[in-house]
Interface confidence: low
């Protein structure tokens, strides 16, 4: 069977948040399979997803060897009845892909706050990257360290000007007004960046002076 | 204050083991990592490992895998390194250093550090 | 394993000169570099990351630049609390994360 029947992938994507990291490429195959195959700048090639009908590769597991590399995927595809030859198989490259640099941030929980007097306390949950070493979950920081920030942006309930304050802890304390109301929200930053450097904004949180002044929020946060 | 405080000098007999502990105090434990450092007399700084508390995840120098482990007691605040089949090369002081990555030792370079075990081996 | 290469091994200086140290790795490091103070008998200090930031609470007049193979530490204005012996230490790759052979600061 030549190479004429298949199609060479393209439109290669990296979708990556928090360091899990996935291939994604058109076009869906007919008759016809893709192999992924990553590597580091001036390493050697390793086989993902091999032989596969999907238009997606998960390759978490390779970029975090070391997620300060730059690595480059390619899609080859193959006939579905294809009998392994010397001939190289069209391929596409993705796109370079340096982790620490590109990985998207997630969406930041506030995970408690308190507000005593005029003083309120507010902290971050300490993001999971979903990647495991050995059998432990990566919090964002334990990879960013000190290059990870976050910006909380507060307002009085009763009014819309937003003020900032920045940490980079997972813990906000800021001074208010007594007896009033605040809403905020936070948002991971890494200032050294020059891309990607802002996650979503968190969900909107309000204090109740009225109501109990220390909460968790709805996200139970499991400490280790 | 943040600090990291290392147990007292030892003296040891070439092919005996050596366990060095560095307590640390003032600041989180297993939100950074812990690196291992060593200087021989009149010599340079030689990186021996890391680990994080957190994971227990580590890193050792290749030339010496083998014959060094470096653990974590999250309870006690206090990292351990131990080195076997102790050679007379080995007589340094010996540093643990706080190190901001808990991944892998990043770039941020090691920013508190004990004050040294001074590990002498001689028969 | 990454080479780092420390020059010059001894440096002769005077109190106000302005120094400059040079590390070279011996493949790209992109910009994972730390410098480290040390003093004898002391434990190293670090003085700057990530190749040009500064750590807290050391004074303005020590500087990082570089990028790729070739960095410099700068002492704008030699002070006599730097005379001391002066680390380069990467971290671009996995273990060993290679310190430089060291620069001498002394009194000329």
């Known amino acids: 069977t030549g190479t004429t029947d298949v199609i060479v992938a393209y439109n290669l994507t990296w979708k990556s948040t928090n360091f899990k990291t996935i291939l994604e490429w058109e076009p869906k195959p007919i008759n016809y399979v893709y192999t992924v195959q990553i590597s580091p700048r001036l390493g050697d090639w390793k086989n993902k997803c091999f032989h596969t009908t999907d238009t997606e590769c998960d390759v978490t597991d390779e970029i975090m060897r070391n997620v300060k590399e730059t690595y480059v995927a390619r899609v080859l595809s193959y006939p579905a009845d294809t009998v392994l030859t010397a001939q190289e198989p069209p391929f596409t490259n993705s796109p370079p892909f340096t982790p620490y640099l590109d990985t998207n941030l997630g969406q930041p929980v506030i995970q408690s706050f308190e507000q005593v007097g005029t003083k309120l306390n507010v902290t971050v949950e300490a993001a999971r990257t979903l990647v495991r070493v050995n059998g432990t979950f990566l919090r964002l920081r334990d990879v960013f360290g000190k290059d990870l920030n976050y910006t909380l942006y507060y307002w009085r309930a009763s009014s819309t000007g937003k003020k900032k304050a920045t940490t980079n802890t997972n813990e906000f304390l800021i001074d208010v007004d007594k007896g009033e109301n605040y809403c905020f929200s936070v948002q991971a930053v890494i200032p050294s960046r020059r891309v990607n450097q802002k996650s979503p904004e968190s969900r909107i949180e309000c204090t109740s002076q009225e109501k109990a002044v220390s909460r968790e929020t709805g996200h139970h946060h499991h400490h280790h | 204050q943040v600090q990291l405080v290392q147990s007292g000098a030892e003296v040891k007999k070439p092919g005996a083991s050596v366990k060095v502990s560095c307590k640390a105090s003032?600041?989180?434990?297993?939100?950074?990592?812990i690196s291992w450092v060593r200087q021989a007399p009149g010599q340079g700084l030689e990186w021996m490992g890391w680990?994080?508390?957190?994971?227990?995840?580590?890193n050792y120098a290749q030339k010496l895998q083998g014959r060094v482990t470096m653990t974590t007691d999250t309870s006690t605040s206090t990292a351990y390194m131990e080195l076997r089949s102790l050679r007379s090369d080995d007589t340094a002081v010996y540093y643990c250093a706080r190190d901001a990555g808990t991944y892998s030792p990043f770039g941020y370079g090691m920013d508190v550090w004990g004050q040294g075990t001074t590990v002498t081996v001689s028969s | 394993d990454i080479q780092m290469t420390q020059s010059p091994s001894t440096l002769s200086a005077s109190v106000g000169d302005r120094v400059t140290i040079t590390c070279r790795a011996s493949e790209s490091i992109s910009n994972w570099l730390a410098w480290y103070q040390q003093k004898p008998g002391k434990a190293p200090k670090l003085l700057i990351y990530?190749?040009?930031s500064l750590e807290y609470g050391v004074p303005s007049r020590f500087s990082g630049s570089g990028s790729g193979t070739e960095f410099t530490l700068t002492i704008s204005s030699l002070q006599p609390d730097d005379f001391a012996t002066y680390y380069c230490q990467q971290f671009q790759k996995l273990p060993p994360f290679t310190f430089g052979g060291g620069t001498k600061v002394e009194i000329k």
């Open positions: 003032g600041y989180t434990f297993d939100a950074y990592g």
């Open positions: 990530k190749a040009y």
């Open positions: 680990i994080a508390p957190y994971s227990g995840n580590t």
